[in-house]
């Protein structure tokens, strides 16, 4: 749903014998890079599953939707899409599943109309803080990006740099305040353990945030207060145990929000009482009738909406002198 789509128009393919030819000249209006399929009518170029190791240099100037999926790009250097004349029409760029492990500063510079970028399913061990902002200025020129899709970009454990993966991603999102206009951000399936507390406050235009299939345990230090335009918040398949009053109040205060909370290991003890009360009253949670307890054992699979305060107890904490080892 997030990838650039194209209409079913006729595609022209370049001949295989041109595979090694790289034109240093500006591309002809109807030229199609080797190993790609092009449709000028659909303004679409597809270079899919061709084991390309670099971005073709001779992309046609008309390209609006560019698929470079299923390749072996490894590194996206600065100005990877800079052309003369520039690719002024390029609006949707899909680089998913292309074995990218490094995206350098300024990789997406000189794409004035780039609206949607999908880097999903790449093991991004090194995402430059300036990958999206293009410069290390404290305030960069605004990026035209409206949708940024970064699902499953976490590299294998042994390939991670000696730093927080969450921190690396957030640094790229916040650098130079270039993404102030971002409206959709997908960060699903990235093993996130936490959400750095400053990230949401600095992306005030977000309408859609997908954090599903991560390992978030708590939202206690996350504030949604500034995300007044948020329309969907996907938190399915995390490790959430309970949502506390502050979070509940913030979510309820967002006028257009829809929240998705399925498949979290909810702990149905006395700390869950406020959330259960809220769930019974709110309309913002989609599929709220599907939410069930995971713990304690005696509550497993009970439906949250069917619980009452008598069900939600906490075992008394014994004074230290009575505790056993």
């Amino acid at each position: 749903s997030s990838s650039p789509t194209s209409s079913a128009s006729s595609f022209s393919s370049s001949a295989p014998f041109l595979a090694s030819a790289v034109s240093a000249q500006p591309p002809l209006p109807d030229q199609c890079p080797a190993l790609c399929e092009c449709s000028e009518a659909a303004r679409t170029v597809k270079c899919v599953n061709r084991n390309l190791t670099e971005v073709p240099t001779d992309l046609p100037a008309y390209v609006r939707n560019l698929f470079l999926t299923g390749n072996q790009l490894a590194v996206l250097p600065a100005g990877a899409f800079a052309r003369r004349p520039p690719l002024a029409e390029l609006a949707a760029l899909n680089l998913s599943g292309s074995r990218l492990d490094e995206v350098r500063a300024g990789a997406f510079e000189h794409l004035p109309s780039l609206r949607q970028l999908d880097l999903s399913h790449n093991p991004l061990a090194d995402l430059s803080p300036f990958a999206f902002s293009g410069s290390n200025a404290s305030v960069s020129a605004p990026s035209p990006l409206v949708e940024l899709i970064l699902n499953h970009i976490v590299p294998p454990e042994d390939e991670r740099q000696n730093r927080s993966f969450e921190g690396m991603v957030v640094a790229a999102l916040l650098a130079g305040r270039a993404l102030q206009g971002l409206r959709r951000l997908e960060l699903a399936s990235n093993h996130f353990l936490y959400l750095p507390r400053d990230v949401l406050a600095q992306l005030p235009s977000l309408r859609h945030l997908d954090l599903s299939n991560n390992s978030l345990v708590s939202l206690t230090y996350v504030s949604f207060r500034n995300l007044t335009h948020l329309e969907s918040l996907h938190l399915e398949d995390n490790a959430l145990k309970v949502l506390h009053n502050g979070t509940l109040a913030e979510l309820q205060g967002l006028p257009h929000i829809r929240v998705f909370l399925d498949n979290n290991p909810w702990v149905c003890d006395c700390h869950m009482a406020d959330m259960v009360t809220w769930l019974k009253e709110t309309e913002v949670v989609q599929g709220k009738d599907r939410l069930t307890c995971a713990y304690p054992e005696k509550m497993r699979n009970r439906v949250l909406l069917e619980l009452n305060s008598a069900d939600l107890d906490c075992d008394p904490i014994l004074p230290p002198s009575l505790q056993t080892s």
């Epitope: 335009h229 006028p255 309309e283």
Partner: antibody, heavy 115, light 107 residues
Framework: EVQLVQSGAEVKKPGESLKISCKGS????????IGWVRQMPGKGLEWMGI????????RYSPSFQGQVTISADKSISTAYLQWSSLKASDTGMYYC????????WGQGTLVTVSS | AIQLTQSPSSLSASVGDRVTITCRAS??????LAWYQQKPGKAPKLLIY???NLESGVPSRFSGSGSGTDFTLTISSLQPEDFATYYC?????????FGQGTKLEIK
């Protein structure tokens, strides 16, 4: 590519009923609100209301509450605007648009109500 | 309902001119303001959202500013294709009202 395609122009008599449609494609239809906007001949834009197709929650402008019904069928990615009894004053161009922020618009449906 | 008042209602200008259109809300609307452009016989098109963010693909000669109740749309150097009607819209509270429009005509 995100597209909203609206049903064709309609000519109706006062008192008749009408349901016009708006079909979304190129995005996850259930995750975005869909709004309706009226533009009477030679006039400005009027916000009528919005619906969330995922759960059919609809919000109306007081000016249109009770006059029209906004609905959606998520199985076919389509939103609807309907009247049970048209008036001559309902004549105008009706647009659907995506999201609370109207970032994509349909091409419009011209509704003419005349005896 | 929040009322939005645009001024002027119509405006004559020449290619190359700098043009400013204002939108005043009857109460504070935070950053929940957008600007749209509509040409005759066409659907409106989003230009600016959240007061000052330029919609992707919109030329940089368009800009938005303001806060609270007073907002402006500026076209730094008018081009022939900019002659159209412009609307502001608030989405801070229901109903999400539009301004009455500003018609920009060739002088």
């Amino acid at each position: 590519e995100v597209q909203l395609v609206q049903s064709g122009a309609e000519v109706k008599k006062p008192g008749e009923s009408l349901k016009i449609s708006c079909k979304g494609s190129g995005y996850r239809f259930t995750s975005y609100w869909i709004g309706w906007v009226r533009q009477m001949p030679g006039k400005g834009l009027e916000w009528m209301g919005i619906i969330y197709p995922g759960d059919s929650d609809a919000r109306y402008s007081p000016s249109f509450q009770g006059q029209v019904t906004i609905s959606a069928d998520k199985s076919i990615s389509t939103a609807y605007l309907q009247w049970s009894s048209l008036k001559a004053s309902d004549t105008g161009m009706y647009y659907c648009a995506r999201s609370v922020l109207f970032d994509y618009w349909g091409q419009g449906t011209l509704v003419t109500v005349s005896s | 309902a929040i009322q939005l008042t645009q001024s002027p209602s119509s405006l004559s200008a020449s290619v190359g001119d700098r043009v400013t259109i204002t939108c005043r809300a009857s109460q504070g609307i935070s950053s929940a303001l957008a600007w749209y452009q509509q040409k005759p016989g066409k659907a409106p098109k989003l230009l600016i959202y959240d007061v000052s963010n330029l919609e992707s693909g919109v030329p940089s000669r368009f800009s938005g500013s303001g806060s609270g109740t007073d907002f402006t749309l500026t076209i730094s150097s008018l081009q022939p294709e900019d002659f159209a009607t412009y609307y502001c819209q608030q989405f801070n509270s229901y109903p999400h009202t539009f301004g009455q429009g500003t018609k920009l005509e060739i002088k």
